[in-house]
Structures are given as C-alpha cells and as structure tokens.
Interface confidence: low
Amino acid sequence: PHLRTFTDRFQTCKVQGAWPLIDNNYLNVQVTNTPVLPGSAATATSKLTIIFKNFQECVDQKVYQAEMDELPAAFVDGSKNGGDKHGANSLKITEKVSGQHVEIRAKYIGTTIVVRQVGRYLTFAVRVPEEVVNAVEDWDSQGLYLCLRGCPLNQQIDFQAFHTNTEGTGARRLAAASPAPTAPETFPYETAVAKCKEKLPVEDLYYQACVFDLLTTGDVNFTLAAYYALEDVKMLHSNKDKLHLYERTRDLPGR
Amino acid sequence: SPCKILKCNSEFWSATSGSHAPASDDTPEFCAALRSYALCTRRTARTCRGDLAYHSAVHGIEDLMSQHNCSKDGPTSQPRLHTLPPAGDSQERSDSPEICHCEKSFHKHSATPNYTHCGLFGD
C-alpha cells in the first residue's frame, strides 16, 4: 500500500503479512497486507486491528477489527464506546457510510481515526497529537512501526520511477519485483491518467499513486482509494500547506 | 507501572475536595495543594517519561499556579482522608469532572497540541 508517515514522507510499501502501523502507550494499530494479484509485489490492506489501551478512568481496553468485506461499526465486544467508565463516551465509533466508512474518535487522547473499505481493500487515516505518538516506554526497543519509521528500504517500491518508465505503455512490470502478472483488465497509460485526473486534478503523489495502482491492477476502485485518502488528509492534517505532496519530497535511500 | 502520577492526581483531588474553582479566600490552601502536587510529580518524573497523564498534570499545574498567583515556594498541604477520582482539567466547572478530563485531556489550558497525520491506502 501507499503510506504517508507522520513526518509526511510518502512511500509505496510491498510489505506482506501483519505489520504495526502505530504502537505507543495508548494505541496499537496493526495492518495485514496481501498481494493484489498472485505473484505481484504490490500489496493492499486486507485487515486492520486497532487496540485502544485501558486509560485511567476514561476508557476500558477496546479492540476494533476490520477485514475485507467486514467494516463493523462496533468494537469486537459489540460496544460502540469506551465501556463502563465515567468517560466512556470519550471513545466513540460512528458509522458514516454503512460498510464503507467508519470514524473512531478518541477524545481522551485527541485522536481521530478514519477507516474505509474501498473496493476490496481497506484504507486507514489518523490524526493524533505528537505527544501521543511520542508516548512510548522505551524508544530503544521500539520495533519497526510504519507510521513513524516508514517501510524498510527493501520493502519499498519506487513507484515514481515506475510512473516515469510506463508513460505511454500499459502495466507490464513492477519496480523492485519480478514481472508482475498482467492485471485482468490493464489500462493503457492514457486511460489511467484520464481516470485519475477526473478525481485528482492536482498532479501530486496521490494522483501518481492512483495512476500506479490502475496500471498495476486494472482495478478502478483504487482511483477512489487515492481520492478518499486525499479527502481524509484534508480533514485530518493540521498543516493545510502540506495536503499535497510532490515528487521532490519523496523518500530517498538512507532515509 | 512505576509511574505514580495517578497517586499524585488523587492526592491533589483529595486535598482540594474536588473543588474546581476555589474561591479567592481558599487560594492559599489551594496553592499549598498545588505545590504538593508539583512536588509529587517531580518525585515521580523519572519513571513517567512519555506518560500522557504525567505531562498533562505538569502542564495543568503550571497553568493553575499562574491562574491563582501561587508562588513556587511556600507551604504544602497534606491530603485529606477521602479521595476523589483524579481529573485533568481542574479549573473547569463540570458536573462530571471525570468526563470533563477524558473529553479534554488534549485540549489543555494553553495551546492546541501539535497534531500529526498518517495514512495508508491503495496498493
């Protein structure tokens, strides 16, 4: 999937399996990514687990779990708030669009999370105070945690290079991967561009991600995934000057 | 957890009987309770690095000290016998201090926190 980190780095990650996105004293988010096509290096998010840890007199520990074709509007215990404590309503799940869009607000830690199902796959966006991000027991033992540290270099796809190399061609390969199987319905480059331009008129990294995803999969739902990801940034990002990211800010080796 | 911030919180609340906005003639006693609270947080500081409740308390104490013109030096108070649930925004009036604290623990007395964003989408 495409990742925008807390430090506004933009990466395309081919990580498969379960990986932690966020892990601190208050919140643990883990995603499971699966290949979009058999044998493809590109992966998308098929499962998401969010753990809100027990917090003082506000909320009990709560677990939220979403999977492909299952975007519940409740925690796994069936509740929609933080439990039985006095401040339980400082953690709330709201269903925005049934089966497609859920918002979780954890006011006690100033955090808003948006989870969507777009097509077969999930998207995730969060707005969180730096103080919460930095609330960890031991920085030295912090494992790989994607929102903070990004993907390991060997798990990144240079999709901008791919984007440049595929102008005028259909999707035939993936950077950093063996030749990807042809998508069931591969778009010509021009069609991909046109479809992405419709939803994403600014040629930023979200637009480029959209083009990459269409060329890689032929699945038009990925246009909406990029569109909603940008919409979520508009809602959640505190710096309105950083809504759009462009090539010059892309992650370089050495991080 | 070795961080004893909740103990400091409850001692402060028992010392002030949960009064949210002490009247001016209560201020010396309130300041003494605040100084005790500050002392308690300093004692547990080393084990509370990165603890959200701890940092909230430290900011809250500073704000309340300045609001009530409390001097940093002066007498401290002993906690009373009965304790109340710890709460965060002690200067706010509310029927339910715990909810107030939970709802507002990141909209503290001063500036809005620095927010950050992370997102994951597509392939």
């Epitope: 399996g17 379960a18 009990d60 215990d77 069936g78 509740s79 039985d84 | -």
Partner: antibody, heavy 120, light 109 residues
Framework: EVQLVQSGAEVKKPGASVKVSCKAS????????ISWVRQAPGQGLDWMGW????????NYAQKLQGRVTMTTDTSTSTAYMELSSLRSEDTAVYYC?????????????WGQGTLVTVSS | QSALTQPRSVSGSPGQSVTISCTGT?????????VSWYQQHPGKAPKLMLY???KRPSGVPDRFSGSKSGNTASLTISGLQAEDEADYYC?????????FGGGTKVTVL
C-alpha cells in the same frame, strides 16, 4: 483484589450436562471478556470459548460447537459454562479466565478451577 | 495434536538460561501480536507470564522474556530458579480459535 471464584467439583454421568459458574469481583465485570479453558488429567490446556459480558457475544472452539453454551449474569457478575452430552473424555479441570476485549486476548486472571468427572 | 508445537521438556541448572520455543503457522504466530505465555505449577491454575509476544505483566520477574522470529515465538528464563520449575504453555489466536501449545515441562536440575 481481582478474583474469579468457581463453583465446586461435579460428578456426572455420560450424556448428562454440567453447568460451572465463575463469580468475578474486584473489577468492572462488563469491561473484560471471560474465556473458558479445560485441562484433562495429565494433559495440556484446551481453549473452549469466550464470552463478552458487555454484549453477550460468544466465540466457541469449533470442536465444541453445539455442545457448549456460555452465558453471563451481569447483575451478579457471574459467568457460566454449560457443557452437554458429556462423555468420559470431558473429564477435566475447567477454568474460567478474564481476558481483554476480544477472544484472542491474553488471560490475566484465572479461577481456581472446577473438577468435572464424567463416569458411569 | 496441538497446532502450536512446544518441546515436551527442557532443563537447566540454577542460574542458567533456558528457552522454550512455540512453533505455529504464519497466521497463528508469524503474523500475530497476540502470543502469550502461561506458567502452571502442579495442582494450580495457570498464571500469565508474558503477553503480546514480549510484554511482562507487573509482578512477573524480569528474568522472563519473550521474542518472536518467523513462525516461532520463544520464552526465555534467564537466571533459572527453583521456583521456575513448572509447565509452560504458549497461546495464540488464529482466525477463529484460540490455540494453546502442548506445554513444556521446565526442570531445574
């Protein structure tokens, strides 16, 4: 102190049912799930299922589906596990354990165990 | 047959370190953050020793530690003591069922 106190030992005949209780104290009963785990003599631990006292949601081990029923009574903070159509291989110590918000969570507090003997 | 495989027994002298492995599949161990470990003395209820692979509940000595590599989770007891002699079980969650390992008897020589 957080505690789970279970009912006493039972002797049952094959084909009968048994209902074991587990009374919780020292914490908010609806804030945690309850899992049931059994242990046959000289054997390892065997997970039976999970119930959320908050919602009544259950998650049973596949091999026990249809034979096990887990319930809770929030007014008395008590969880119950009923196993029907008992057979001799159901002879075991049955434990209740407190877990987090989902069936997959760790079990941080355990009851003392209830020995159920199935014998003709 | 348990879906999580543990050695039947391990032993060590006081002060030594012993490691117990717990091998499963990618879904039960490899991809899971929900691995926990339990200690059980004869005739007693199990006791939680580690959770979420590496985390130690309060009251559990720091000589108990956890790790995971691939599809194998491990519990290490460093500085073995007489009271550590017990059965140890790993637990994880795969799909719909919670799984326990078959148990490992730790003997202090």
């Amino acid at each position: 102190e957080v505690q789970l106190v279970q009912s006493g030992a039972e002797v049952k005949k094959p084909g009968a049912s048994v209902k074991v209780s587990c009374k919780a104290s020292g914490y908010t009963f609806t804030s945690h799930g309850i899992s049931w785990v059994r242990q046959a003599p000289g054997q390892g631990l065997d997970w039976m299922g999970w119930i959320s006292p908050y919602s009544g949601n259950t998650n049973y081990a596949q091999k026990l589906q249809g034979r096990v029923t887990m319930t809770t009574d929030t007014s008395t903070s008590t969880a119950y596990m009923e196993l029907s159509s008992l057979r001799s291989e159901d002879t075991a110590v049955y434990y209740c354990a407190r877990v987090g918000s989902g069936p997959y969570y760790y079990m941080d507090v355990w009851g003392q165990g209830t020995l159920v003997t199935v014998s003709s | 047959q348990s879906a999580l495989t543990q050695p039947r027994s391990v032993s060590g002298s006081p002060g030594q370190s012993v490691t117990i492995s717990c091998t499963g599949t990618s879904s039960s161990v490899g991809d899971s953050i929900y691995v926990s470990w339990y200690q059980q003395h004869p005739g007693k209820a199990p006791k939680l020793m580690l959770y979420d692979v590496t985390k130690r509940p309060s009251g559990v000595p720091d000589r108990f530690s956890g790790s995971k590599s691939g599809n194998t989770a491990s519990l290490t007891i460093s500085g073995l003591q007489a009271e550590d002699e017990a059965d140890y079980y790993c637990k994880s969650y795969a799909g719909t069922d919670t799984l326990f390992g078959g148990g490992t008897k730790v003997t202090v020589l």
